[in-house]
């Protein structure tokens, strides 16, 4: 990946748009297709002040852990979908796009240096465990994906890219 491509806001916006499209395709979280088992996903809620006050290294740890869990979750959803009878083609397409998107974002974040922080997280003993929740529908899964990109990932890359510019 070209260095710091993630710092071009249009790149992240493309993935956010894909995630929103996937959420819309699943027809709303109440009546949309259900997952045959609950899947653990990262909690995407952000207390904006608390997030901004975190060290960028701590943000990186949380983003990296969230990205890993989200990737696992979507791969798990793909496996569940493959085992279901007559999986809708459009849903399969969006699962594949999400997996591809998460792989690309992971590569882009590596270039930004987020992975380094995970190898030696600051005050690892004091770091709070990643908050999680469960998704029981494809809609909720894609909504978490969309919110994670719009929230923690976008805020982290904004800060990390700004630092890199100094």
């Amino acid at each position: 990946a070209p260095p710091r491509l993630i710092c071009d806001s249009r790149v992240l916006e493309r993935y956010i748009l894909e995630a929103k499209e996937a959420e819309n395709v699943t027809m709303g979280c109440a009546e949309g297709p259900r997952l045959s088992e609950n899947i653990t996903v990262p909690d995407t809620k952000v207390n904006f002040y608390a997030w901004k006050r975190m060290k960028v290294e701590e943000q990186a740890v949380e983003v990296w852990q969230g990205l890993s869990l989200l990737s696992e979750a979507i791969l798990q959803a793909q496996a569940l979908q493959a085992n279901s009878s007559q999986p809708p083609e459009s849903l399969q397409l969006h699962i594949d796009k999400a997996i591809s998107g998460l792989r690309s974002l992971t590569s882009l974040l590596r270039v930004l240096g987020a992975q380094k922080e995970l190898m030696s997280p600051p005050d690892a003993t004091q770091a709070a465990p990643l908050r999680t929740l469960t998704a029981d529908t494809f809609c909720k899964l894609f909504r978490v994906y969309s919110n994670f990109l719009r929230g923690k990932l976008k805020l982290y890359t904004g800060e990390a890219c700004r630092r890199g510019d100094r």
Partner: antibody, heavy 117, light 108 residues
Framework: EVQLVQSGAEVKKPGESLKISCKGS????????IGWVRQMPGKGLEWMGW????????RYSPSFQGQVTISADKSISTAYLQWSSLKASDTAMYYC??????????WGQGTLVTVSS | SYVLTQPPSVSVAPGKTARITCSGD??????AYWYQQKPGQAPVLVIY???KRPSGIPERFSGSNSGNTATLTISRVEAGDEADYYC??????????FGGGTKLTVLG
């Protein structure tokens, strides 16, 4: 004890400029943000913007962008809200509040601004 | 821009439970905050991060948030709880949005 003390009530004419202040004490001023909130007579709370006095980062509500200017002087632990040209519709109570992980956890007493010809 | 909608008024008898709602598109994806404002006074934060209480706020105040609706629940309502209540939330972009407010009337 955390305290935010705001400047006194103001009566102004349309077109005049104004700068009101909010002085923080009892805590590290640069470790928290200051937010500004408008409350028009008999109406609800409206977030105007916040400032991080440490990094001088400011975010305005889209409704107030270009209408007011938020600033801070960390050397005297004071935040400011200013207008270059007041309108009658700016008549309101203006509150400053400390922003922490518990947002707007401490409030000033409010500054009443009256704009009338 | 993001909009939070509250009922203009809620009435409750003393000793009963009051529930004040706040609705917004996918509000459950964001943290909800609640403020109490008595006439002539500055607002006071009573709930933050959906359900946490700042120190000094009685246990009678609780909050929840899921789907499109956040709810402030005040159990064993007292006359002193009569006030305007405002919900709020952070957006991902860093804007802080207040709801229109709900006037809580304690009957009797």
């Amino acid at each position: 004890e955390v305290q935010l003390v705001q400047s006194g009530a103001e009566v102004k004419k349309p077109g005049e400029s104004l700068k009101i202040s909010c002085k923080g004490s009892g805590y590290s001023f640069t470790s928290y943000w200051i937010g500004w909130v408008r409350q028009m007579p008999g109406k609800g709370l409206e977030w105007m913007g916040w400032i991080d006095p440490y990094r001088s980062e400011i975010r305005y509500s889209p409704s107030f962008q270009g209408q007011v200017t938020i600033s801070a002087d960390k050397s005297i632990s004071t935040a400011y809200l200013q207008w270059s040209s007041l309108k009658a519709s700016d008549t309101a109570m203006y509150y400053c509040a400390r922003v922490s992980s518990e947002p707007f956890d401490s409030w000033g007493q409010g500054t009443l601004v009256t704009v009338s010809s | 821009s993001y909009v939070l909608t509250q009922p203009p008024s809620v009435s409750v008898a003393p000793g009963k439970t009051a529930r004040i709602t706040c609705s917004g598109d996918k509000l459950g994806d964001h943290y909800a905050y609640w403020y109490q404002q008595k006439p002539g006074q500055a607002p006071v934060l009573v709930i933050y991060d959906d359900s946490k209480r700042p120190s000094g706020i009685p246990e009678r105040f609780s909050g929840s948030n899921s789907g499109n609706t956040a709810t402030l629940t005040i159990s064993r309502v007292e006359a002193g709880d009569e006030a305007d209540y405002y919900c709020a939330t952070w957006t991902f972009e860093g804007d802080y949005v207040f709801g229109g407010g709900t006037k809580l009337t304690v009957l009797g």
